[in-house]
C-alpha cells in the first residue's frame, strides 16, 4: 500500500480467483484512543472498533472511503483505491490501446518544433468518475524538470456503437535548447483513477522522434503564361523552430484529381516553391517534414487548382 | 588541448554537399544494422545513448546559430570562453567563430572514423560475417574531413590483443551509429546555416 495523495491510498492487488488478497491496517488520525468505530462509504454498518482497523482487500467491493468516528463525529477518512495485477500484468482497463505506432500504445505525444513543448493525448470509453494526473521529466535516474498542465477533455467521437473520449495535456521542458542533441528521453507518467480503480501509464521518447510540423502556410498558386503549369509557393509554419536555415524543412507537393483513384503526381523539394501541372478539378497539397531527421510529415495544406 | 588551426574553404560549401552525403550514408548504415541485427538490441528505444565526443568536443555549442545564443538553456553547458565575449557574438560570422565550429566538427569526424575503423577490423574477424561497415560511409567521412581542410595529427587506430566479443561489438556498433546519426544531423543543420549566412 502506498499514498497517492493526502488520505488516498493505493492497494496493489495481485488478483486471481480465490486469491487471499492484501491485508491492510488503517489507523485513525486522532489522539483519541477509545470509543472509535469504522464505516465504509455511506453505509452505517460498523466494520470494527478501535484506533486501527485491519481489513482483507480481495476485490473492489473492499475498496472505498473508510471513516473513523467517535460519538457521531467524523475523525478521519482513508480512501482506498485498487491497482490490480492479473497474470503478472498491471491492468490497463481505463485507457484504450491506440495500436499506433505499435500495440500497447496508450499515450501518444507530438511536438510542433524543438522548443521542448509537446502535447500528449489518450483515449477512453469512460465518461464519468474519471481523473488524470500527469507528471513528466527528462530522464529518470537524475530527472530534469518538465512542467505539465492539467489534462482536459479535448474531443468526443462516436464510431458505430463506440463512444470515445480524447484527453490531452501540454507539457514544457523547463530549460530546453532547440539545438541540443538529446541523450536522455522525456518520460511521461499518467495516473488514471476511475471510481476506485487506479492505473498508471508511461511513455518515453525523444522530442526529435515525436516532431510533427504544422502544415505549410500561405499556400498560393501563380499561373505561368501560355502554360498549364503553375508555380506553387508556401511558407514555413509559424510554429516551426527558427532559424529556418538551421531547422530546415523538406516538402512534398502533390497534385490530386477529384477522384481518389486518379494517379497522384508528387514532387519533393527543399525549396518553398515548385512548378507543377494543374489539372482541371484537381487540388494541390503541400506537407512538410524535418529535412534532416525523418520524423512525421505534417498534415496537408491544400488549395484547389481552378 | 590545442584546437587545430583552421583554413576554412572560402566557398563554403562543398561541405554542405558532403554533409548531406554523410547523413544519407549513416542513416542507410543504421537502417542496415537494424535489419541485420534484428535480434540484438539495436533500436533507439533499446540502446543506451552514449556520445563518444562528450567532454572532448563541443560541436553543438560551438556551432550554435546566432539566434539561439540568446537562449539561456543553450548556453548552460558551454565551456568555451568566447561565448561571453560580446564582440564575438556580434560578429558571429568571423572566421574565428566559424573555425572553432568547423574544427569541432572535424574532431568529431576523426573520433568516429577511428572508432568505426577499429570496430570494422573486429567485425571482419567474426566467423558469422554478419555485418560490416559500409565502405561508402567511411569514404564520405573522409571526404568531409578533407573538405573541411584542417591539418591535425592523425590518431592511430586502436588495436586490441584480446579476443573480440562479437555480441558486444555489434551492440556497440548500434550505439555508435545512433549517436553518429544524431551528430550528422547537427552537422547538416550547421552546414545549411553557414551556407545560408
Amino acid at each position: 500500500i502506498w499514498e497517492l495523495k493526502k488520505d488516498v491510498y493505493v492497494v496493489e492487488l495481485d488478483w486471481y480467483p480465490d486469491a487471499p488478497g492484501e491485508m491492510v491496517v488503517l489507523t485513525c488520525d486522532t489522539p483519541e484512543e477509545d470509543g472509535i468505530t469504522w464505516t465504509l462509504d455511506q453505509s452505517s454498518e460498523v466494520l470494527g472498533s478501535g484506533k486501527t482497523l485491519t481489513i482483507q482487500v480481495k476485490e473492489f467491493g473492499d475498496a472505498g472511503q473508510y471513516t473513523c468516528h467517535k460519538g457521531g463525529e467524523v475523525l478521519s477518512h482513508s480512501l482506498l483505491l485498487l491497482h490490480k495485477k492479473e497474470d503478472g500484468i498491471w491492468s490497463t482497463d481505463i485507457l484504450k490501446d491506440q495500436k499506433e505506432p505499435k500495440n500497447k500504445t496508450f499515450l501518444r505525444c507530438e511536438a510542433k518544433n524543438y522548443s521542448g513543448r509537446f502535447t500528449c493525448w489518450w483515449l477512453t470509453t469512460i465518461s464519468t468518475d474519471l481523473t488524470f494526473s500527469v507528471k513528466s521529466s527528462r530522464g529518470s535516474s537524475d530527472p530534469q524538470g518538465v512542467t505539465c498542465g492539467a489534462a482536459t477533455l479535448s474531443a468526443e467521437r462516436v464510431r458505430g456503437d463506440n463512444k470515445e473520449y480524447e484527453y490531452s495535456v501540454e507539457c514544457q521542458e523547463d530549460s530546453a535548447c532547440p539545438a541540443a542533441e538529446e541523450s536522455l528521453p522525456i518520460e511521461v507518467m499518467v495516473d488514471a483513477v476511475h471510481k476506485l480503480k487506479y492505473e498508471n501509464y508511461t511513455s518515453s521518447f525523444f522530442i526529435r522522434d515525436i516532431i510533427k510540423p504544422d502544415p505549410p502556410k500561405n499556400l498560393q498558386l501563380k499561373p505561368l503564361k501560355n502554360s498549364r503549369q503553375v508555380e506553387v509557393s508556401w511558407e514555413y509554419p509559424d510554429t516551426w523552430s527558427t532559424p529556418h536555415s538551421y531547422f530546415s524543412l523538406t516538402f512534398c507537393v502533390q497534385v490530386q484529381g477529384k477522384s481518389k483513384r486518379e494517379k497522384k503526381d508528387r514532387v519533393f523539394t527543399d525549396k518553398t516553391s515548385a512548378t507543377v501541372i494543374c489539372r482541371k478539378n484537381a487540388s494541390i497539397s503541400v506537407r512538410a517534414q524535418d529535412r534532416y531527421y525523418s520524423s512525421s510529415w505534417s498534415e496537408w495544406a491544400s488549395v484547389p487548382c481552378s | 588541448r590545442n584546437l587545430p588551426v583552421a583554413t576554412p574553404d572560402p566557398g563554403m560549401f562543398p561541405c554542405l554537399h558532403h554533409s548531406q552525403n554523410l547523413l544519407r550514408a549513416v542513416s542507410n548504415m543504421l537502417q542496415k544494422a537494424r535489419q541485420t541485427l534484428e535480434f540484438y538490441p539495436c533500436t533507439s528505444e533499446e540502446i543506451d545513448h552514449e556520445d563518444i565526443t562528450k567532454d572532448k568536443t563541443s560541436t553543438v555549442e560551438a556551432c550554435l546559430p546566432l539566434e539561439l545564443t540568446k537562449n539561456e538553456s543553450c548556453l548552460n553547458s558551454r565551456e568555451t570562453s568566447f561565448i561571453t565575449n560580446g564582440s564575438c557574438l556580434a560578429s558571429r560570422k568571423t572566421s574565428f567563430m566559424m573555425a572553432l565550429c568547423l574544427s569541432s566538427i572535424y574532431e568529431d569526424l576523426k573520433m568516429y572514423q577511428v572508432e568505426f575503423k577499429t570496430m570494422n577490423a573486429k567485425l571482419l574477424m567474426d566467423p558469422k560475417r554478419q555485418i560490416f561497415l559500409d565502405q561508402n560511409m567511411l569514404a564520405v567521412i573522409d571526404e568531409l574531413m578533407q573538405a573541411l581542410n584542417f591539418n591535425s595529427e592523425t590518431v592511430p587506430q586502436k588495436s586490441s590483443l584480446e579476443e573480440p566479443d562479437f555480441y558486444k561489438t555489434k551492440i556497440k556498433l548500434c550505439i555508435l551509429l545512433h549517436a553518429f546519426r544524431i551528430r550528422a544531423v547537427t552537422i547538416d543543420r550547421v552546414m545549411s546555416y553557414l551556407n545560408a549566412s
Epitope: 473492489f60 467491493g61 482497463d93 456503437d161 463506440n162 463512444k163 476511475h194 476506485l196 | -
Partner: nanobody, 123 residues
Framework: EVQLVESGGGVVQAGESLRLSCAAS????????MGWFRQAPGMEREFAAA????????YYADSVKGRFTISRDNAKNTVYLQMSSLKPEDTAVYYC????????????????WGQGTQVTVSS
C-alpha cells in the same frame, strides 16, 4: 446508455440446469465487466458471478462456485449464466449488471441493470 435484457428464466426441478442470457446494447458495451446478481423474496440482492470485459477472467460467489459458469460472446454482445445442479435456495429473480470495476461483488460498483428474470427451483 447501456440497456440489458435478461431471458431464459423459468421453473425447473432441483438438480436440473438452466441457462440465462443477457443481451447488452448501447455504447461501448464490449468494454463493460458483466455480472449476475440475484434477489430472493424478502432478501437483499446478492452477487452470483462476474466476468471481465475481455472474457478471460471470472469470479464467483462461494454459494455458486462449481455449479454456475459465467461466459460472454462479445460478437453477440451477450453474457450467459449456465446454472447446473440447481437447488431450491437458488430460487430468485436474476439480474444482469454492467460496470467497470472487476472483480466486484458489490452491487454499487455496477452502473447498469436489467429488469431481471425469475428462476424457480422446486424440490
Amino acid at each position: 446508455e447501456v440497456q440489458l435484457v435478461e431471458s431464459g428464466g423459468g421453473v425447473v426441478q432441483a438438480g436440473e440446469s438452466l441457462r440465462l442470457s443477457c443481451a447488452a446494447s448501447g455504447y461501448n458495451v464490449k468494454d463493460y465487466e458483466m455480472g449476475w446478481f440475484r434477489q430472493a423474496p424478502g432478501m437483499e440482492r446478492e452477487f452470483a458471478a462476474a466476468i471481465s470485459w475481455r472474457g478471460s477472467s471470472t469470479y464467483y460467489a462461494d454459494s455458486v462456485k462449481g455449479r454456475f459458469t459465467i461466459s460472454r460472446d462479445n460478437a453477440k454482445n451477450t453474457v450467459y449464466l449456465q446454472m447446473s445442479s440447481l437447488k431450491p435456495e437458488d430460487t430468485a429473480v436474476y439480474y444482469c449488471a454492467a460496470g467497470r470495476l472487476y472483480p466486484s461483488s458489490r452491487s454499487r460498483d455496477y452502473d447498469y441493470w436489467g429488469q431481471g428474470t425469475q428462476v424457480t427451483v422446486s424440490s
